[in-house]
């Protein structure tokens, strides 16, 4: 027999977790005139939702409680004066990644 | 030293994958007239993004190639027809599952 | 497939204005260097002006700055080139053309729009 | 500006026999990265200019064998092992180590 209070209970802790999500390293960055390689990398994100969250609100979302910035080293290709050769170097990037996450009210409407 | 070649694969691999979301039963299922216990259950559905695409379109989209529909028991509440009170009963639902997830182009954009 | 078309030549009179466009399809457009590149009779081939991926980085020959703007919305995967105090000697075919990824050479290039100056 | 000066101008040749287009630079044509970047593109009646060869000796992709390219310094070549009907056009040089970069004049190759 299920334990349904357990699938409830569940629900709640594994809805709304850290996930995998490949960012742009450009987009991320605001670096138009850079491309880096890989141009995406893999960062721990709040993923999944709060279909039923326990918050009294219209609405829930799910959000980072914890934020680090990890450090990832990456080939950076700029252009240089001229249409041939780009500047090719090694550089480390520093990304967002969420530790721990919650479900939250979005706005104010109560909690 | 990083290993780049590495870093993309690992971006391609784990970017667009099977995760935990929890669904309402009653909106997965349409059934407005009846209360399910627990209201939400975890499943898996393709996540993640595919930021960095392989396909040259302008917009790639993390989509599930490989769905299973699985059973959950649950108990459902339906109000009894005439009378006051609810009818109590445990019941399978059936939802889908992603098992297996592919970053494709959205539209027909080439590939 | 990588396709690069480009709009807007015509008949312009000496010391007018015009903006041609290139519609890029079949690639990540701002993933991509782009250039362009001028056919006249006289001169030959002749290389116009360069953008980089962003459109913060861009070069052009002595003979064109202040006179040619190459611009680019990546949002629309469109790249311009502005063309202001027109001479009868700009009188050309104008191509537009993708550098490669590493900026080793021109990939592809577009069929061409012809702009003509004359009074 | 390096000037790209091409030889012959014209170049009449019978199909099946070989072809060699000379491009000379007025300077040598080596960028700051070490790379020399000497291309070759072809535009043939009617069409846009293509890409045959890039860094001296590199075929681009889709471009038939019998296409190779040589050279250093100043002094390089594009040759055809054997001309084919489709081989018409006009051939260009091009030097993308300096600025401006600049093109040769072009080299006709028709069939006698």
């Known amino acids: 027999v299920v334990d349904l209070n357990l699938l409830t209970e569940e629900v709640r802790l594994y809805s709304c977790t850290p996930r995998n999500f490949s960012v742009s390293i450009r987009e991320e960055l605001k670096r138009t005139d850079t491309i880096f390689w890989p141009g995406c990398l893999l960062v721990k994100r709040c993923g999944g939702n709060c279909a039923c969250c326990l918050h009294n609100c219209n609405e829930c979302q799910c959000v980072p409680s914890k934020v680090t910035k990890k450090y990832h080293e990456v080939l950076q290709l700029r252009p240089k004066t001229g249409v041939r050769g780009l500047h090719k170097s090694l550089t480390d990037v520093a990304l967002e990644h969420h530790e721990e996450c919650d479900c939250v009210c979005r706005g104010s409407t109560g909690g | 030293v990083v290993d780049l070649n590495l870093l993309t694969e690992e971006v391609r691999l784990y970017s667009c994958t099977p995760r935990n979301f929890s669904v309402s039963i009653r909106e997965e299922l349409k059934r407005t007239d009846t209360i399910f216990w627990p209201g939400c259950l975890l499943v898996k559905r393709c996540g993640g993004n595919c930021a960095c695409c392989l396909h040259n379109c302008n917009e790639c989209q993390c989509v599930p190639s490989k769905v299973t529909k699985k059973y959950h028991e649950v108990l459902q509440l339906r109000p009894k027809t005439g009378v006051r009170g609810l009818h109590k009963s445990l019941t399978d639902v059936a939802l889908e599952h992603h098992e297996e997830c592919d970053c494709v182009c959205r539209g027909s954009t080439g590939g | 497939e990588v396709q690069l078309l480009e709009s807007g030549g015509g008949l312009v009179q000496p010391g007018g204005s015009l903006r041609l466009s290139c519609a890029a399809s079949?690639?990540?457009?701002?993933?991509?260097?782009m250039s362009w590149v001028r056919q006249t009779p006289g001169k030959g081939l002749e290389w116009v002006a360069t953008?980089?991926?962003?459109?913060?980085?861009?070069y052009y020959p002595d003979s064109m700055k202040g006179r040619f703007t190459i611009s680019r919305d990546n949002a629309k995967n469109t790249l311009y080139l502005q063309m202001n105090s027109l001479r009868a000697e700009d009188t050309a075919v104008y191509y537009c053309?993708?550098?490669?990824?590493?900026?080793?050479?021109?990939?592809?290039w577009g069929q061409g729009t012809l702009l003509t100056v004359s009074s | 500006d390096v000037v790209m000066t091409q030889s012959p101008l014209s170049l009449p040749v019978t199909l099946g026999q070989p072809a060699s287009i000379s491009c000379r630079s007025s300077?040598?044509?080596?960028?700051?990265?070490?790379?020399?970047?000497l291309e070759w593109y072809l535009q043939k009646p009617g069409q846009s200019p293509r890409l045959l060869i890039y860094?001296?000796?590199n075929r681009f992709s889709g471009v038939p064998d019998r296409f190779s390219g040589s050279g250093s310094g100043t002094d390089f070549t594009l040759k055809i092992s054997r001309v084919e009907a489709e081989d018409v056009g006009v051939y260009y040089c091009?030097?993308?180590?300096?600025?401006?970069?600049?093109f040769g004049q072009g080299t006709k190759l028709e069939i006698k």
């Open positions: 053309a993708r550098q490669a990824p590493l900026w080793d050479y021109f990939d592809y």
């Open positions: 079949g690639f990540t457009f701002s993933s991509y260097g």
């Open positions: 953008i980089g991926y962003g459109g913060s980085f861009t």
């Open positions: 300077q040598t044509i080596v960028h700051s990265d070490g790379t020399t970047y």
């Open positions: 860094k001296v000796s």
């Open positions: 091009f030097q993308g180590s300096h600025v401006p970069p600049t």
